[in-house]
């Protein structure tokens, strides 16, 4: 550890007189501290020196002696008091700088250790300090403000007794400022912007801090646009607003927008489209095919996507038939915006009827005109199946009728014994029909097919079965045949219509 | 031995605030009092202000209303903003580290900082 | 316009002694000790002298500062190509309580 002569931690002198600090170390040895430029410094061996032959109060203050090689780091320190009658206070700065919940140190250094009873800190021109302010006083360093805050961010003085007068100190700014957590917060609105030609137009770009020393500016394509900016205070952060008015936006105007805020912490962006048009516009789309097929009983939402400027002045939704003239209720419509210039409607349709398949129609409108985009729905259904005993052309026959979307096909079977149902171990015969006779096709409606099975005799004590099936499901129906007659049996699943 | 390093930007726009921080390596910015200091491209030095590890600042009068200086001992860091900048304030920008009588007697190598649009 | 007043520029032969003043006031020179720099092309500044005469370590002896009243030189004797940079003046300013600074003397060596 370094030595300093005089070996003393305290020295005081008059104004005027000759003062040498001399420190030795094992190594070179360096003085430290604020700048105190009223001294000579140089070195001898081992040793440094600070010399003046003319000490004044301004050479009062703490003179640290280290040694630059020491891996301890050891240090040694005397200070000195120049006790000027004139002159209670040396002031090292009149301005500090400080984060808030940090100790503040004003360093009004005293002159005179004599003088310590009866100091006190005051804020400028006799203030008292503001409540709460929590403060103590050493005679080497200052006063400490512990835990400043940022109102306590002030011009203070130093205060001494002497001769039963008060002297202050020169004044002392302290700036507290405010931790901050990360670059300014931003908004830039709107977010995306669409104009016709001729047009107005604003854009406004804002940034906030709980500090003031952030900088904000708009620009447009890399271009740093010139706009007077508007500043404001309140709820504890500071706010710099940039607004831009187009009164009669051009082609040239279009592009992005970003606006930008920078301070200590960093830099914040965030950006926008502005579109310029040169008349409205209404765009009509869907992600789903304009084609569904649902089964019957089931759910459905039609969703259509609308882009369009200006805003929309009317929308519905219809459904054109074929069944009814029913039309969609209002609470099955919904509408959700997306963003300023895109929307989503959608049509709810829960619980297919066999009377709601049809063209559904989404209809909007806006200085641009009308568009119109159409849905066609098509229910399935599982195929209901009846079987009758007939005569054609003199030949008896089974005549199987199956009815469903899609198409059906159809199968026939038959099988040892009376039963509602043929099983694997019972079916004697299978014939497919692979191209049965349509009877009806129209759109929106189930496809009705027919099946004929040509029979010479009938076996009394067998059943025949017309099965029917598609995507959605199957259906049967059995065809016993008994000596008054032929007899009939639907299954039991299909005894109801869904 | 102590080195100091600058970083910051080496362009900034008119009117836009310059940044710059100064990273101490091998010493601790809690001793001595460490300085900004500049010079315009062939021209002579100018100070702008020094800070001291307690918040002691001192600031060049004729630069003061647009200076901040503030240090961060956790990072062995002390920075420089000054606001509001013109094409006066294109300069090389070094930061030193003050001795006790007004010396300044390690500097770092400096950075070149251009204000344009 | 520097606050402390040096020649524009200086030069002298190579052995040669060759001295560049600095003038000042009394509250910067006249109250305060003088430090020189010396910046060499596309270097940082480097601290040559400090307290008006002192040399940091690795400062040959060739170079020598003195000071009275309001008035520095800066003394360099055996002059070498190396030495061919550019030198400036300072001392803390009382009125400013920071550094001023001479507006540099550029040194050739011929």
């Known amino acids: 550890i370094p030595v300093i002569e005089p070996s003393v931690p305290e020295l005081v002198v008059k104004p005027g007189a000759t003062v040498t600090l001399r420190c030795v170390g094992n190594g070179s040895v360096e003085w430290d501290g604020p700048p105190s430029p009223h001294w000579t410094l140089y070195s001898d061996g081992s040793s440094s020196i600070l010399s003046t032959n003319n000490a004044t109060f301004q050479n009062t203050g703490t003179y640290r002696c280290t040694e630059p090689g020491d891996p301890l780091g050891g240090s040694a320190a005397i200070h000195l008091y120049v006790k000027d009658p004139a002159r209670p206070w040396n002031v090292l700065a009149q301005e500090v700088v400080v984060f808030e919940d940090q100790d503040a140190l004003l360093p009004c250094l005293l002159t005179d250790p004599v003088l310590e009873a009866g100091v006190s800190l005051v804020r400028v021109r006799g203030r008292p300090l503001m409540r709460h302010t929590n403060y103590s006083f050493s005679p080497w360093h200052g006063f400490t403000i512990h835990r400043a805050k940022f109102i306590q961010s002030q011009d203070y003085q130093c205060s001494a007794l002497m001769g039963g007068r008060k002297v202050m100190s020169i004044s002392i700014r302290l700036k507290v400022q405010k931790v901050i957590p990360g670059p300014p917060a931003l908004t830039l609105v709107p977010a995306e912007l669409v104009r016709i030609r001729g047009e107005a137009a604003q854009i406004v770009c804002s940034a906030s801090s709980v500090d003031v020393n952030f900088d904000v500016f708009l620009q447009h394509n890399n271009t740093k646009l010139a706009i007077p900016q508007q500043s404001d205070f309140h709820n504890n952060r500071y706010q710099k607003v940039l607004t831009l008015n187009l009164d009669q936006v051009d082609f040239q105007h279009a592009g992005n927008y970003s606006c930008v805020a920078s301070n200590v912490q960093g830099k914040h962006s965030t950006s926008m489209f502005f579109r310029v048009v040169e008349s409205a516009y209404l765009n009509l789309s869907s992600e789903q095919n304009l084609i569904q097929e649902v089964t019957v009983g089931e759910g459905l939402n039609l969703k259509v996507m609308v882009e369009a400027y200006p805003g929309l002045q009317g929308f519905n939704w219809t459904y054109l038939g074929p069944f009814s003239d029913h039309q969609p209720e209002p609470k099955l419509a919904n509408a959700t915006t997306k963003d300023t210039y895109r929307h989503t409607f959608t049509l709810s349709l829960p619980r297919l009827k066999p009377s709601e398949a049809g063209r559904y129609s989404f209809l909007a409108r806006n200085p641009g005109g009308w568009r119109a985009l159409t849905f066609e729905l098509t229910l399935r259904y599982p195929p209901e199946v009846s079987v009758i005993w007939t005569f054609i052309n003199g030949s008896g026959t089974l005549l199987c009728a199956a009815s469903g979307y899609p198409q059906p096909n159809v199968t026939w079977l038959q099988c040892s014994g009376h039963t509602d149902r043929c099983d694997e171990a019972q079916v004697l015969q299978v014939w497919d029909d692979p191209y049965p006779e349509v009877l009806s096709q129209e759109p929106f409606h189930k496809v009705t097919v027919q099946s004929l099975l040509t029979v010479e005799t009938l076996e009394h004590n067998q059943t025949y079965e017309c099965r029917a099936h598609n995507s959605v499901g199957s259906g049967s129906w059995a065809f016993i045949p008994i000596s008054a007659g032929a007899h009939t049996h639907p299954p039991d699943e299909f005894l109801f219509t869904p | 031995q102590v080195q100091l390093q600058e970083s910051g930007p080496g362009l900034v726009k008119p009117s836009e605030t310059l940044s710059l921080t100064c990273t101490v390596s091998g010493g601790s910015i809690s001793s001595y009092y460490w300085t900004w200091i500049r010079q315009p491209p062939g021209k002579g030095l100018e100070w702008i202000g020094y800070i001291y590890y307690s918040g002691i600042t001192n600031y060049n009068p004729s630069l003061k209303s647009r200076v901040t200086m503030s240090m961060d001992t956790s990072k062995n860091q002390f920075s420089l903003r000054l606001s509001s900048v013109t094409a006066a304030d294109t300069a090389v920008y070094y930061c030193a580290r003050g001795r006790i009588i007004g010396a300044f007697d390690i500097w770092g190598q400096g950075t070149m900082v251009t204000v344009s649009s | 316009q520097s606050v402390l007043t040096q020649p524009p520029s200086a030069s002298g032969t190579p052995g040669q002694r060759v001295t560049i003043s600095c003038s000042g006031s009394?509250?910067?020179?006249?109250?305060?000790?003088v430090n020189w720099y010396q910046q060499l092309p596309g270097t940082a500044p480097k601290l040559l002298i400090y307290s008006n005469n002192q040399r940091p370590s690795g400062v040959p002896d060739r170079f020598s500062g003195s000071k009275s009243g309001t008035s520095a030189s800066l003394a360099i004797s055996g002059l070498q190509s190396e030495d061919e940079a550019d030198y400036y003046c300072a001392a803390w300013d009382d009125s400013l309580n920071g550094p001023v600074f001479g507006g540099g003397t550029k040194l050739t060596v011929l």
């Open positions: 009394s509250s910067n020179i006249g109250s305060n000790t």
